[in-house]
């Protein structure tokens, strides 16, 4: 769509395109399956405009339909991942608080290999928290070009 | 300066246990996976366990999977590795060592080694 | 689990001399993740080369690595005297995480 000279003036947040590319901090400790995310410029190419990060989850600041990603490479990974663990390897992407909205959103399986990469179009409202949980013995790269995690507004 | 200093080796008969340490120092302990490799008289490296900076996952080679446990104390900087069930072949130098921060297990600095002798 | 083979099991050279050292996987590595390390008697591994070819932090510029899929190489471009060792590669790319057993580089 066509922008007036007035809204190109605006800075992005005001015109609702919040987006948001996360870069992985850490695991979390036994009996928490969360991954912990950063985002800034002084660590690379990651960055928050609009949501925000609430110890390492990301909080959504405005309702709307984003476009969510992520993908997940294992530093350590064995070829025969899933045959090896008697528990499902599988990443699981979503909204973790309010616990009213609580919903997967995205579901992954290690089938074998050692990467995994999805996104989905979903509705999104403002204070969702979303957690991209870890399910098994995993070890995942912090290489940015490995493991990121992102959000981008896309209507209302 | 990054230091790892292991320590618990000794000798030992088959079927003992033995618990080895290893004091980190110089880095923020918390953020690095570290690993357990160790080296036969005269023989190749071998890897045997890794740990996850949080703790929250743990990985063992074939051959002391269910004898070794790996575990980390962040409050205190230091790697633990209980060996249990020990053999005459588990006779070796056992190295910490710590991962390069994206977690890949190629070993960035190493400490100087714990002799463990397994003997009757 | 992957093998890595090194060859050759010694190498007698004279400093100044150029060192090619191979290393042979039995499947190919997932990402040229490989790295090599130096180890001098009674001491600890230090590492020298990861993802084959990035050289570590404080590594002198005679070492490099390079190589892909199953045949990677260190080369020691000039021999220094403090560079007779023994030298060993590491597969990273799947669990368990394997090495070679070793490359003696020695003085003629």
């Known amino acids: 769509q066509r922008l007036s000279r007035a809204q190109q003036q605006l800075p992005l947040e005001s015109l609702g395109w919040d987006i948001a590319e996360l870069q992985l901090n850490h695991t979390g400790p036994q009996q928490d399956p969360r991954l912990y995310w950063q985002g800034g410029p002084a660590l690379g190419r990651s960055f928050l405009r609009g949501p925000e990060l609430d110890k390492g989850q990301l909080r959504i600041r405005r309702d709307g339909i984003y476009m969510v990603h992520i993908q997940v490479t294992l530093a350590i990974c064995s070829s025969t991942s899933t045959s090896r663990h008697h528990h499902p390897t599988t990443l699981a992407v979503g909204i973790c608080s309010p616990a009213s909205r609580s919903i997967s959103l995205l579901r992954l399986s290690f089938h074998q290999g050692c990467t995994i990469a999805s996104q989905r179009l979903t509705p999104l409202a403002r204070g969702d928290t979303l957690c991209t949980n870890l399910t098994g013995t995993l070890l995942p790269s912090r290489n940015t070009d490995e493991t990121f995690f992102g959000v981008q507004w896309v209507r209302p | 300066e990054v230091q790892l200093l292991e320590s618990g080796g000794g000798l030992v008969q088959p079927g003992g246990s033995l618990r080895l340490s290893c004091a980190a120092s110089g880095f923020t302990f918390s953020s690095y996976a570290m690993s357990w490799v160790r080296q036969a008289p005269g023989k190749c490296l071998e890897w045997v366990s890794a740990?996850?900076?949080?703790?929250?996952?743990?990985f063992y080679a074939e051959s002391v999977q269910g004898r070794f446990t790996i575990s980390r104390d962040n409050s205190k900087n230091t790697l633990y590795l209980q060996v249990n069930s020990l053999r005459a072949e588990d006779t070796a130098v056992y190295y910490c060592?710590?991962?390069?921060?994206?977690?890949?297990?190629?070993?960035?600095?190493w400490g100087q080694g714990t002799l463990v002798t397994v003997s009757s | 689990e992957i093998v890595l083979t090194q060859s050759p099991g010694t190498l007698s050279l004279s400093p100044g001399e150029r060192a090619t050292l191979s290393c042979r996987a039995s499947?190919?590595?997932?990402?040229?993740?490989l790295a090599w390390y130096q180890q001098k008697p009674g001491q600890a591994p230090r590492l020298l080369i990861y993802g084959a070819s990035s050289r570590a932090t404080g590594i002198p510029d005679r070492f490099s690595g390079s190589g892909s899929g199953t045949d990677f190489t260190l080369t020691i471009s000039r021999l220094e005297p403090e560079d007779f060792a023994v030298y060993y590669c590491?597969?990273?790319?799947?669990?368990?995480?394997?090495f070679g057993c070793g490359t003696k580089v020695e003085i003629k």
């Open positions: 499947q190919s590595v997932r990402g040229n993740y």
């Open positions: 590491q597969q990273y790319g799947y669990s368990p995480f394997t």
């Open positions: 740990i996850s900076g949080s703790g929250g996952s743990t």
């Open positions: 060592a710590r991962h390069d921060y994206s977690n890949y297990p190629y070993f960035d600095y």
